[in-house]
């Protein structure tokens, strides 16, 4: 596959991953109430996210409450906020860097420098994926640990929410996309023949005698 194709595919994956990461960051479903027993007859489900918690009644009515105080939040929610928002912003920076290094743009002159810019974009997306993975795994670890902790009240046990799965899928896309961008940039530097279209010189017009220049034959 040519480096341009790798670049386009990588960028598309990264953009989808970025969108997924924004969605995961905003959704209030990082942890959801676990219904563990037939004994617990509850008419509501609780969702908790980074910015708000929601109570969904059995009637379908949902009431959300944005967290009031940042200082009152648990350490992992504060850290998850910072790291997830940081990853979203880093992906935004990575987009411009990648576009600047893309073969279809003229921000940077074609050559090794352009390939290095593209490589930087790919590396930034990889870092972005890793950065987002930290809060997702940390949060998941806490939810799972508390689920199995016998000291935690039964009604206070939570399960992994949809936002975590969306986040994991997004980080996978960011990292695969970043990897493809890095591969594309590496192809550019090591195999220049695969990076840009080969320029062929048009054959000369036939001479008056009707002969072709022998140089045009292999």
């Amino acid at each position: 596959m040519g480096s341009a194709a790798l670049e386009i595919l990588g960028l598309v994956l990264c953009l989808v991953g970025w969108g997924g990461l924004i969605l995961a960051c905003g959704l209030p479903m990082w942890q959801v109430t676990a219904f563990l027993d037939h004994n617990i007859v509850t008419a509501q489900t609780t969702w908790k996210g980074l910015w708000m918690s929601c109570v969904v009644q059995s009637t379908g009515h949902m009431q959300c409450k944005v967290y009031d105080s940042v200082l009152a939040l648990s350490t992992e929610v504060q850290a998850a906020r910072a790291l997830t928002v940081g990853a979203v912003l880093l992906a935004f920076v990575a987009l411009f860097v990648t576009l600047a290094g893309a073969q279809c743009t003229t921000c940077v002159a074609p050559g090794p420098a352009k390939a290095r810019v593209a490589l930087t974009g790919g590396v930034l997306y990889l870092l972005c994926g890793l950065l987002a993975l930290v809060p997702l795994c940390w949060f998941a670890n806490i939810v799972v640990r508390e689920f199995y902790d016998p000291s935690v009240p039964v009604s206070q046990k939570y399960e992994l929410g949809a936002a975590l799965y969306i986040g994991w899928a997004a980080t996978a896309l960011l990292m695969v996309g970043g990897g493809l961008l890095c591969c594309g940039a590496w192809v550019c530097t090591s195999r220049p023949d695969l990076s840009f279209p080969v320029k062929y010189s048009a054959p000369r017009r036939p001479t008056a005698t009707g002969d072709y220049d022998k140089k045009n034959y292999v």
């Epitope: 563990l36 027993d37 037939h38 004994n39 617990i40 648990s74 350490t75 992992e76 508390e146 016998p150 000291s151 935690v152 009240p153 039964v154 009604s155 206070q156």
Partner: antibody, heavy 117, light 112 residues
């Protein structure tokens, strides 16, 4: 030997605040959930609040929710109960208890809180 | 909230007699997650704090004499003192630790 000793009780006027402390020794404090349980004079036991290992999760009884705050300082091996907007029905002996697996296995001797004008 | 109903409220017994205290919960305390009945029994002597006797309905706390026997499952539980001793004179409470708010029975006062 496991020891829990409550302090900070006394006489307080309705609407005022009071902070109870519970000094702990004889076990690794941060390895256990902790709780406050109270007993009104000549009455039964009532669970007040519980707190997780690092204080990340706190749980309260309906009668104290929004008025009382349970907290802990693992470095000082101390459990706290901040009581605001006290009412006459909060008059009780307050016990600090170790709280593994949702039961209370060790209790302090208690501290008496009297809410009266 | 889970309501705990204890009976009788008081009982006068003789030394050596077998005592039975009943505790009923408004819902089953058997948690399918660990297959345990989340009920505990406490003893409180006059002027003292409570002492854990039994947890998980039938598991005796270390140091508790074997004359104290916990039994039952689901919503019906029993504390049996097989041979009443003078030092067993106290108020006994059952407590559900199935879920919050944790609730206690009103207590059973044992007198000699």
């Amino acid at each position: 030997e496991v020891q829990l000793v409550e302090s900070g009780g006394g006489l307080v006027q309705p609407g005022r605040s009071m902070k109870l402390s519970c000094a702990v020794s004889g076990f690794t404090f941060s390895d256990y959930y902790m709780a406050w349980v109270r007993q009104a004079p000549k009455k039964g036991l009532e669970w007040v609040a519980s707190i997780s290992y690092e204080g990340r999760n706190t749980y309260y009884g309906d009668s104290v929710k929004g008025r009382f705050t349970i907290s802990r300082d693992n470095a000082k091996n101390t459990l706290y109960l901040q009581m605001n907007s006290l009412r006459s029905e909060d008059t009780a002996t307050y016990y600090c208890a170790r709280h593994p697996r949702r039961y209370f296995d060790f209790w302090g001797p208690g501290t008496m809180v009297t809410v009266s004008s | 909230d889970i309501v705990m109903t204890q009976s009788p409220s008081s009982l006068a017994v003789s030394a050596g007699e077998t005592v039975t205290i009943n505790c009923k919960s408004s819902q089953s305390l058997l948690f399918s997650g660990d297959q345990e009945n989340h009920l505990a029994w406490y003893q409180q002597k006059a002027g003292q704090s409570a002492k854990l006797l039994i947890y998980w309905a039938s598991t005796r706390e270390s140091g508790v004499p074997d004359r104290f026997i916990g039994s039952g499952s689901g919503a019906d539980f029993t504390l049996t003192i097989s041979s009443m001793q003078a030092e067993d004179r106290a108020t006994y409470y059952c407590q559900q630790n199935y879920d919050i708010p944790y609730t206690f029975g009103a207590g059973t006062k044992l007198e000699l």
